[in-house]
């Protein structure tokens, strides 16, 4: 969603003309640098310095090869569409020396009835139509080709799949006389994979299906289907894995019950129950078998679908996810937060931590935020001293011995990382918080006070002196 803000009205820069790559003259060797490092051991700084100097020395001869942009390709099969019947598509930046492919599913909530889909169409059309998509996009975070911004997979083939189906990537119904909108999220993924096979994916070693928010849930719903699709098409050697960011929601009780009128006020279960019918939503087959007919909505919730998945999935989830709090009707704009809200928030963190207990590969910082993997600061957050790119690298390494992730991470290379401190932003590496009213940056202590945090009570709960607790908060421990 970042980097998507300049798409219709802005007149700063016309899109560049489509690039055609000049073919080398007959008999000329084609240079390629297959720098596909699976793991970088030893001195990371020295490695980065070498990469930088190599990049700089290559830059004059091939400036356009270092272009950060992913280029738009609308699907050739125009029957696979966005909500309004316009063709779906994907943005691609190839990396010819690499056998890794990263397919990223965009997020952006959903709509679940005619009224809120109409309203979405009139205010957020880019999430329902490809008619005004820009020709290029810049890859950020895990989609960046800069080693500094993406130490994890900077050299991979990058694919960004825009979300234009409003169905949490689950739908399989086309636009018709009866249906004003098409909901084809699941089919869009299948078609993108099919088209990419002709663009080099056929030679892939690893396909990482990633996504944020609704895209993160989309990963959980589609990763096994993609693996099955590739097997059926004759590519069983491609290892399919998932990376679900901010898509692991709880079907919990709302803080304040509200009628299911609008997307953001509707309880998670209500919204998905309605949506799955409206979209003709599909869920993973093994999960579907666990629930009786009409109960398929359960499979949209990570902790219920995860145990049924065959593909390895890495789960990234803020313990205090803003989208979860929004659907739970916890709005942190009043000041201070009431005690009931504060307890509800703490309990949410506890519940979420509980659901991640048996997730082999996870990264769950105790922060109040939403989405991370395509943010440029995604390298900055740490859990127990390990950053997300590092944890992903450790997860990757665990596959080298066996096809299935080994249960025990290597010493000093963990990938099950869940914060255990109990409050939002008790982790000092959390993204900066700003006072919602003044816009000023706040430290952890200020933030917690702002939220109505009672030092006396909490110190008592934790069995420590209030002064010691305040000191800990100020130091960010």
């Amino acid at each position: 969603s970042e980097g998507r803000k300049t798409w219709r009205r802005r007149g700063q820069q016309p899109p560049p003309p489509p690039r055609t790559e000049a073919a080398p003259a007959a008999g000329q060797p084609v240079e390629s640098f297959p720098l596909d490092f699976t793991a970088v051991e030893g001195n990371m700084d020295s490695f980065m310095a070498q990469v930088k100097s190599l990049a700089q020395s290559l830059y004059p001869c091939s400036a356009q090869q270092l272009n950060e942009d992913l280029r738009l390709h609308l699907l050739l099969n125009t029957s696979v569409t966005c909500n309004d019947g316009s063709p779906a598509g994907y943005y691609l930046k190839e990396s010819r020396g690499s056998r890794r492919w990263l397919l990223f599913l965009e997020g952006g909530w959903y709509c679940f009835n005619r009224e809120n889909c109409d309203s979405r169409y009139d205010t957020m059309r880019r999430l329902m139509s490809s008619r005004d998509w820009p020709r290029t996009r810049t890859g950020t975070g895990i989609l960046s080709s800069q080693p500094e911004e993406n130490p994890y997979w900077w050299n991979a083939n990058m694919v960004f799949i825009p979300y234009c189906s409003s169905d949490v990537w689950s739908g399989a119904s086309s636009k018709s006389e009866k249906n004003e909108y098409a909901f084809m999220g699941a089919l869009i993924i299948q078609e993108v994979v099919r088209e990419l096979l002709g663009r080099g994916l056929s030679g892939a070693k690893v396909l990482l299906l990633a996504g944020s928010s609704a895209g993160g849930t989309g990963v959980l719903l589609n990763v096994d289907r993609v693996a099955e699709q590739l097997e059926k098409l004759g590519y069983p050697a491609i290892q399919v894995r998932g990376l679900a960011d901010s898509g692991w929601f709880l079907d919990n009780k709302q803080y304040r019950r509200s009628d299911c009128i609008d997307t953001i006020n509707c309880a998670p279960t209500d919204a998905i129950r309605r949506g799955i019918r409206y979209w003709s939503g599909m869920v993973p087959e093994r999960c579907q078998r666990q629930f009786k007919e009409g109960e398929e909505w359960n499979c949209f919730f990570g902790y219920k679908v995860y145990p049924t998945l065959r593909c390895p999935v890495f789960v990234v989830q803020w313990l205090f996810d803003e989208a979860q709090l929004t659907v739970d009707n916890v709005h942190l704009t009043g000041q201070p937060v009431q005690e009931g809200q504060w307890l509800y928030i703490q309990n949410l963190g506890r519940e979420l931590r509980g659901t991640l207990k048996d997730v082999q590969a996870s990264f769950a910082p105790a922060c109040l935020s939403h989405e991370i993997i395509i943010r440029s600061y995604w390298t900055d957050v740490q859990v127990k001293g390990t950053s997300l790119p590092r944890a992903l690298h450790c997860w990757d390494r665990s596959f080298h011995d066996s096809h299935k992730a080994s249960k025990t991470p290597m010493k000093g290379c963990p990938f099950h990382l869940v914060d255990s401190c109990p409050w939002p932003h008790c982790n000092p590496s959390c993204p900066t918080i700003r006072d919602q009213f003044t816009g000023q940056e706040m430290n952890v202590a200020q933030f917690l006070m702002h939220m109505g945090f009672d030092v006396q009570t909490v110190a008592q709960q934790q069995g420590m002196e209030p002064s010691k607790l305040l000191g800990m908060l100020s130091n960010g421990n």
Partner: antibody, heavy 119, light 111 residues
Framework: DVQLLESGGGLVQPGGSRKLSCAAS????????MHWVRQAPEKGLEWVAY????????YYADTVKGRLTLSRDNSKNTLFLEMTSLRSEDTAMYYC????????????WGQGTSLTVSS | DIVLTQSPASLAVSLGQRATISCRAS??????????IHWYQQKPGQPPKLLIY???DLESGVPARFSGSGSGAAFTLNIHPVEEEDAATYYC?????????FGSGTKLEIK
Amino acid sequence: DVQLLESGGGLVQPGGSRKLSCAASGFTFSDFGMHWVRQAPEKGLEWVAYSSSGGTTVYYADTVKGRLTLSRDNSKNTLFLEMTSLRSEDTAMYYCARASYDGGYFDCWGQGTSLTVSS
Amino acid sequence: DIVLTQSPASLAVSLGQRATISCRASKSVSTSGYSYIHWYQQKPGQPPKLLIYLASDLESGVPARFSGSGSGAAFTLNIHPVEEEDAATYYCHHSRELPFTFGSGTKLEIK
């Protein structure tokens, strides 16, 4: 040139009815959600109602629910607002506004039509 | 419904100085990287005119002395340097969900 032109205002007795129109030109009318916004004398702006681009969904502010009917004729590029059981507090300048579909902001407004409800 | 609280109700600013208007939402109006807050200027006898959309984007034809910032539930409109012709009432508006609402307005007077 994008233009919106409201008409139909005037003096109406309390309990009476009135139909306001908004004629659009210079853009593909059926591509845009349309809204009515009103402004009582010396007061601020109040959002009143929304019609989706296809005309299939309408939504009203609580203050007018049950007394207003919004409709549109995309073939004639016209938006209508039918008002019944009018009260003195409905006295206002009524503006028709086009909502941009990349954010829902009102990027084009009509000049407004003035409605006075008084005996 | 989302309530927008605008402040101050009125302000007087000297020519060439900075005018700052605040708009607070009762809950977050930001989602998927966008903030659904917009700013309008209205002069007596005229319809409102769009200045800033999606919290910080300047509408074409609007002078660069107008700027918007903020995210979540807190937003600001800045005018610097203020000019004579900026005397008007300014409104914030959200389009995050239906029903849309407006702030109560801020009347700017030039000293």
